[in-house]
Interface confidence: low
């Protein structure tokens, strides 16, 4: 088998999937202590490009709730308050790391799963296809 | 304690920190599959509030490497190509969970941890405070 | 483009010494912890040494201990493995790799030197 030198602190594996099976704590770690607690929290109404969030919810994930922004209109809020559809309001999103239980319904164990999330809109000048 | 229903198939954990300590599979699961994979490529340029991407490496993390959203400017482009000071740029955050080593340079063994990452920008209406 | 390329493989008797070598490129080499990997012939992959970004911490397998020495020289981009007192189980192609997160999901190899231990 394939013997790892290692700091002499480390955990032992004697998984058989070893070393595609690691030990993961999941006492979280937060490094964002010095962030401002309402962040984005109101620029989703206050955006040129509106959104809305919709829960994501899944047991056999973790985190098991995902919010999902989706944008309120195809175009952009203008100077006026009204809608200008020569302006379009698009999703950002970012692939993000989950974790899955697995085999399913397993309290310890997970499979590492790669998700795309939509985490708010912004408002982008449309690419235009002139026909000729 | 609390007692977890579990799969006949799962995994049995002998570590000491069970439950805070779990088993996760790195063969990565890619939801992924039918996004277009230039997704949010090009918006950083065509966005009213654009943005730069600036490179975080730090090899002892999973994913090593995190692109961070940086808004270009305080104001928004507004419809001639210029900033707008009336209107600003914010960066859309979003908590992410990462794979830390611990103890460092265990093969076998991370930690799980929460960081704050910009996105992308959005063009917001400011808050404006009036003095009396 | 990330390239590694390594050297100084080749017969030796038992009880003998070589050198490896690694030269590295296409990435920040300083920022990575570096790892030796061998393979004997119809077995699978043996991590051998790593060694810390700044070369301060140095792990390897038990049966290395004593007669192995990995280095590295993040001026020149390089790195090394001081191998003595070789016997006949230490033939193996060894392969040099630079180490992400997951170690033994390594992003790249090089193509790897063979070292040959026989009388």
């Known amino acids: 088998g394939i013997t790892i030198p290692r700091n002499p602190g480390c955990p032992n594996s004697e998984d058989k999937n070893f070393p595609r099976t690691v030990m993961v704590n999941l006492n979280i770690h937060n490094r964002n202590t010095n962030t401002n607690p309402k962040r984005s929290s109101d620029y989703y109404n206050r955006s040129t490009s509106p959104w809305n969030l919709h829960r994501n919810e899944d047991p056999e994930r973790y985190p098991s709730v995902i919010w999902e922004a989706k944008c309120r209109h195809l175009g952009c809020i203008n100077a006026d308050g009204n809608v200008d559809y020569h302006m379009n309001s698009v999703p950002i999103q970012q692939e993000i790391l989950v974790l899955r239980r697995e085999p399913p319904h397993c309290p310890n164990s997970f499979r590492l799963e790669k998700i795309l999330v939509s985490v708010g809109c912004t408002c982008v000048t449309p690419i235009v296809h002139h026909v000729a | 304690g609390i007692t977890i229903p579990r799969n006949p198939g799962c995994p049995n954990s002998e570590d000491k920190n069970f439950p805070r300590t779990v088993m996760v599979n790195l063969n990565i699961h890619n939801r992924n599959t039918n996004t277009n994979p230039k997704r949010s490529s090009d918006y950083y340029n065509r966005s009213t509030s654009p943005w730069n991407l600036h490179r975080n490496e730090d090899p002892e993390r999973y994913p090593s490497v995190i692109w961070e959203a940086k808004c270009r400017h305080l104001g928004c482009i507004n419809a001639d190509g210029n900033v707008d000071y009336h209107m600003n740029s914010v960066p859309i955050q979003q908590e992410i969970l990462v794979l830390r080593r611990e103890p460092p340079h265990c093969p076998n063994s991370f930690r799980l941890e929460k960081i704050l990452v910009s996105v992308g920008c959005t063009c917001v209406t400011p808050i404006v405070h009036h003095v009396a | 483009e990330v390239q590694l390329v390594e050297s100084g493989g080749g017969l030796v008797q038992p009880g003998g010494s070589l050198r490896l070598s690694c030269a590295a490129s296409?990435?920040?080499?300083?920022?990575?912890?570096m790892y030796w990997v061998r393979q004997a012939p119809g077995k699978g992959l043996e991590w051998v040494a790593s060694i810390k970004q700044d070369g301060s911490e140095e792990y390897y397998v038990d049966s290395v201990k004593g007669r192995f020495t990995i280095s590295r020289d993040n001026a020149k981009n390089s790195l090394f493995l001081q191998m003595n007192s070789l016997r006949a189980e230490d033939t193996a192609v060894y392969y040099c790799?630079?180490?992400?997160?997951?170690?033994?999901?390594?992003?790249?190899w090089g193509q790897g030197t063979l070292v040959t231990v026989s009388s």
């Open positions: 790799a630079k180490g992400e997160i997951l170690p033994l999901y390594f992003d790249y």
């Open positions: 296409g990435f920040t080499f300083s920022s990575y912890q």
